[in-house]
C-alpha cells in the first residue's frame, strides 16, 4: 500500500496557545525507525516547527528546546504544539519519514489550518 | 548563489578505484541532504546515491550498493563518492545535486558534471 | 522499485505551441513527483517540483498536474528556449527513478 499522511483540517488551539492534533500514516514496509516532521507554511514559505526520530514501539522525542511533544503508537502519532499565538495561525503540515530499514519512503500531509487567539487581557479591578 | 562543482573524474581501468569530490558553496551545506546523480554517455539519469544533511542516513541504487560510498565533510562544505570495482557500466557524467529541505528525494541544483570512464 | 514511463519519448512542435508530456508510475507515489529540463551538454535543472503548494519561481506556461500513479506537464506557449528534453522524477521511495526523457524538438 502507498505512503499515506492523513491529519485534521482544522484544529483551534485552546486559550493557553496550545494545539494538538493527530497524525496518521499508512505504511508500505514495516519500519522501525520513523522521523516526524512538522512543518509551517506561510505564503509558499516552508519553515520546520520540530522534528522527532523515533524507534516503533518506543516513545518520540523531540529536543528540549522544542515547542513540541507526542506521543506514538503504532502509525498514529499525538502531536501538541505549545506556546502558540494569533501571529502563529498558518498550516502545519505533518511529514513522516520510513528511515529504516531501507528502502526510505516519505509522505506528506495536506495540513492542519491551527487558529490561534490571543487571549483578551484581563481588565484591571479597582 | 548556490553553486557545486564536481572534480575527480577521468579515464580508469575495470576494476580499479576512483574518488570524486564535490565542493559547495553559497548555502547551508550542513542543512542540506546531498546526492550524486549519473547520466551514461547519450542516455537518460540514474540516481546513485544520497547522504543525509548530518551523515545519519545513506542509501544506494542496487546497481552500486556494495561498491560505491557516499560521504560528507560538512567542515570542508565537501560532498565525495568513492567508487570501486568500476566496470564499464559505471562510465558517465556523474552530477552531484543539493537535495530539498522539505523533501530529500529532490533535485534542487545540480553540479556541472565530472566525466567518469571505464576503460581498458 | 518504482518504475517510470513518458510518453511521447520525442515531439516535435513549433513556438507558440502547447505541449502536454505524460508521466505514469508503477505504483502511488502521492503527488512526490518533480519535473527537470534538460539541455544538450548541460546538466539538469529543476522545472517542477511537489508538493505543488511549496514551489516558486515556476514560469507561468509552465504546469504540473497529477497525482497517484499519472502525471503530466503542460507547456501553454512553447518557447524557444523550451526546445529540450524533460525527465519526471519521483521523491516518494528509494531508489529515487527518472522517467526515460521526453525530447521536444523544433518541427
Known amino acids: 500500500k502507498a505512503m499515506h499522511v492523513a491529519q485534521p483540517a482544522v484544529v483551534l488551539a485552546n486559550s493557553r496557545g496550545t494545539a494538538s492534533f493527530v497524525c496518521e500514516y499508512a505504511s508500505p514496509g514495516k519500519a522501525t525507525e520513523v522521523r516526524v516532521t512538522v512543518l509551517r507554511q506561510a505564503d509558499s514559505q516552508v519553515t520546520e516547527v520540530c522534528a522527532a526520530t523515533y524507534m516503533m514501539g518506543n516513545e518520540l522525542t523531540f529536543l528540549d528546546d522544542s515547542i513540541c511533544t507526542g506521543t506514538s503508537s503504532g502509525n498514529q502519532v499525538n502531536l501538541t504544539i505549545q506556546g502558540l499565538r494569533a501571529m502563529d495561525t498558518g498550516l502545519y503540515i505533518c511529514k513522516v519519514e520510513l528511515m529504516y530499514p531501507p528502502p526510505y519512503y516519505m509522505g506528506i500531509g495536506n495540513g492542519t489550518q491551527i487558529y490561534v487567539i490571543d487571549p483578551e487581557p484581563c481588565p484591571d479591578s479597582d | 548563489q548556490v553553486q557545486l562543482v564536481e572534480s575527480g573524474g577521468g579515464v580508469v581501468q575495470p576494476g580499479r578505484s576512483l574518488i570524486l569530490s564535490c565542493a559547495a558553496s553559497?548555502?547551508?551545506?550542513?542543512?542540506?541532504?546531498m546526492h550524486w546523480v549519473r547520466q551514461a554517455p547519450g542516455k537518460g539519469l540514474e540516481w546513485v546515491a544520497v547522504v543525509w544533511y548530518d551523515g545519519s542516513n545513506k542509501y544506494y541504487a542496487d546497481s552500486v550498493k556494495g561498491r560505491f560510498t557516499i560521504s560528507r565533510d560538512n567542515s570542508k562544505n565537501t560532498l565525495y563518492l568513492q567508487m570501486s570495482s568500476l566496470r564499464a557500466e559505471d562510465t558517465a557524467v556523474y552530477y552531484c545535486?543539493?537535495?530539498?529541505?522539505?523533501?530529500?528525494?529532490?533535485?534542487?541544483?545540480w553540479g556541472q558534471g565530472s566525466l567518469v570512464t571505464v576503460s581498458s | 522499485d518504482i518504475q517510470m514511463t513518458q510518453s511521447p519519448s520525442s515531439l516535435s512542435a513549433s513556438v507558440g505551441d502547447r505541449v502536454a508530456i505524460t508521466c505514469r508510475t508503477s505504483q502511488s507515489i502521492s503527488n512526490l513527483l518533480n519535473w527537470y529540463q534538460q539541455k544538450p551538454g548541460k546538466a539538469p535543472e529543476l522545472l517542477i517540483y511537489?508538493?505543488?503548494s511549496f514551489q516558486s519561481g515556476v514560469p507561468s506556461r509552465f504546469r504540473g498536474s497529477g497525482s497517484g500513479t499519472d502525471f503530466t506537464l503542460t507547456i501553454s506557449s512553447l518557447q524557444p528556449e523550451d526546445f529540450a528534453t524533460y525527465y519526471c522524477?519521483?521523491?516518494?521511495?528509494?531508489?529515487?527513478?527518472f522517467g526515460p526523457g521526453t525530447k521536444v524538438d523544433i518541427k
Open positions: 511537489a508538493p505543488s
Open positions: 545535486a543539493r537535495g530539498g529541505i522539505v523533501v530529500p528525494g529532490l533535485f534542487e541544483y
Open positions: 522524477q519521483q521523491s516518494y521511495s528509494t531508489p529515487f527513478t
Open positions: 553559497g548555502f547551508t551545506f550542513s542543512s542540506y541532504g
